[in-house]
Amino acid sequence: QRLPRMQEDSPLGGGSSGEDDPLGEEDLPSEEDSPREEDPPGEEDLPGEEDLPGEEDLPEVKPKSEEEGSLKLEDLPTVEAPGDPQEPQNNAHRDKEGDDQSHWRYGGDPPWPRVSPACAGRFQSPVDIRPQLAAFCPALRPLELLGFQLPPLPELRLRNNGHSVQLTLPPGLEMALGPGREYRALQLHLHWGAAGRPGSEHTVEGHRFPAEIHVVHLSTAFARVDEALGRPGGLAVLAAFLEEGPEENSAYEQLLSRLEEIAEEGSETQVPGLDISALLPSDFSRYFQYEGSLTTPPCAQGVIWTVFNQTVMLSAKQLHTLSDTLWGPGDSRLQLNFRATQPLNGRVIEASFPAGVDSSPRAAEPVQLNSCLAAGD
């Protein structure tokens, strides 16, 4: 089923960084056009355990007050699934020295629930978004971002952690999902596919986009990521789909042009501060929201996901650079670093705008199959 054409209301209309033109329905491949690629090839369809990069590469974390951000986020969290006690430890080299949570990969062994039991939870991410079934929630107000336009100094840490490319963000990037729902940005990273193969984590009516950006935030109610993991609303992720467009995206180029320097797994570089908000769509008012999980071990639940309706445009060359430059574990290319979509298990995805419109000519009024749950309570 194709997404309806609705001037400015068309779910997942294109444009970003100042480009507001929504895509028409012909611009979005239908489910028939692109097979529903739940997993990267060769991956077993085990619930809750497939693919994804260091999206929640949240390791030993502590409030930070300088260039690398409010929290230390080099690789993986020091925490197991909530409820599993663990001694505090220095974890800067977990990925190299090996502790259970660092030994996961996309596809193959070990099964993620063995790495972290939470990966077998009932409310996991990513999910398939079906706008027709989303509950329109007028209480979902435009997102508020403050301090995202960073000066060039100090430089930021850009790292190939073997699962993704991650940019650690400094303190001072504040985001509000609504009144009293305030967060601090910690890091951002990307998920992508391979040549001719899309690699977003979330899908829309089965359609997978070329890539996806995740900006990970910690609730201001918590001082540390390990305190917030598993707590409802403890973490929040802003997600946007990346699509191919005719022009180079200058904001993304500031990062993509540096990927060659960090081609090797575990390598990193310093990049000038930039306008982080320019990496996101320009329309902060139209989005989908649901409660899910980290998409990589430890797969902790309680994460508030906000998926922008508008997409971000990158050139074909930029998307190729993203998917074809980095190397991961075992001399393999870092590609297809996305987890399979997970079952909703009764969850209702909310929309900040009336996304569920029946595209047939008979429908004079929007059809909302789900009602809004009290958002923001």
């Epitope: 930070k64 260039e67 690398e68 570089t269």
Partner: antibody, heavy 116, light 107 residues
Framework: QVTLKESGGGVVQPGTSLRLSCAAS????????MTWVRQAPGKGLEWVGL????????HYTDSVKGRFTISRDNAKNSLYLQMNTLRADDTAVYYC?????????WGQGTLVTVSS | VLTQPPSVSVAPGQTARITCGGN??????VHWYQQKPGQAPVLVIY???DRPSGIPERFSGSNSGNTATLTISRVEAGDEADYYC????????????FGGGTKLTVL
């Protein structure tokens, strides 16, 4: 590999000027912020100042503000430190280094002696 | 202000610990440099505990509260040098701040 080489040091009298240069190679110079650090004889390291990748932003330590100016020419892969109104306590080995938050590569340094 | 002990002495094969004190330094990232006589400093630890390539695993770092620590295990004669801690402090005009340095003597 990354190489940084300072030049321009020497013996000068108080109140005069000197310009230090740092030639960079082995990396894309225009991608990185650059830092000057100095070390007085027998003393510790002291940050002098730094400049952003494109030269648009500079920061200085208090003791050199208004006297020292950091600049760069990305086309020439070169970093500069213009030192005016030099004082005896500016005597030190001056190092250029790559990076702002931390300095991952350093030059070998050039000695500046300010003496009457 | 970052405070380091002026000197630390240790026998070969033992473990040396060099501290760097500062108000709530645990909220900042600490970087460590080694400097041998007549040479330029070398980065040995960055972001509290990460090691640049080429630095032996014997070098490690930690940071919490008001103290950051550089630990050198199985100390060798070649480790004798001055060690400096450093932070970025955007809240002050001195954006890059170095500790006073610690002379490590291998007995």
């Amino acid at each position: 590999q990354v190489t940084l080489k300072e030049s321009g040091g020497g013996v000068v009298q108080p109140g005069t000027s000197l310009r230090l240069s740092c030639a960079a190679s082995g990396f894309t110079f225009s991608n990185y912020a650059m830092t000057w650090v100095r070390q007085a004889p027998g003393k510790g390291l002291e940050w002098v100042g730094l400049i952003s990748y494109d030269g648009s932003v500079t920061h200085y330590t208090d003791s050199v503000k208004g006297r020292f100016t950091i600049s760069r020419d990305n086309a020439k892969n070169s970093l500069y430190l213009q030192m005016n109104t030099l004082r005896a306590d500016d005597t030190a080995v001056y190092y250029c280094a790559r990076g702002s938050g931390y300095q991952e590569h350093w030059g070998q340094g050039t000695l500046v002696t300010v003496s009457s | 202000v970052l405070t380091q002990p002026p000197s630390v002495s240790v026998a070969p094969g033992q473990t040396a610990r060099i501290t760097c004190g500062g108000n709530n330094i645990g909220s900042k990232s600490v970087h460590w440099y080694q400097q041998k006589p007549g040479q330029a400093p070398v980065l040995v630890i960055y972001y509290d505990s990460d090691r640049p390539s080429g630095i032996p695993e014997r070098f490690s770092g930690s940071n919490s509260g008001n103290t950051a620590t550089l630990t050198i295990s199985r100390v060798e004669a070649g480790d004798e040098a001055d060690y400096y801690c450093q932070v970025w402090d955007s809240s002050s005009d001195h954006h890059v701040v170095f500790g006073g340095g610690t002379k490590l003597t291998v007995l």
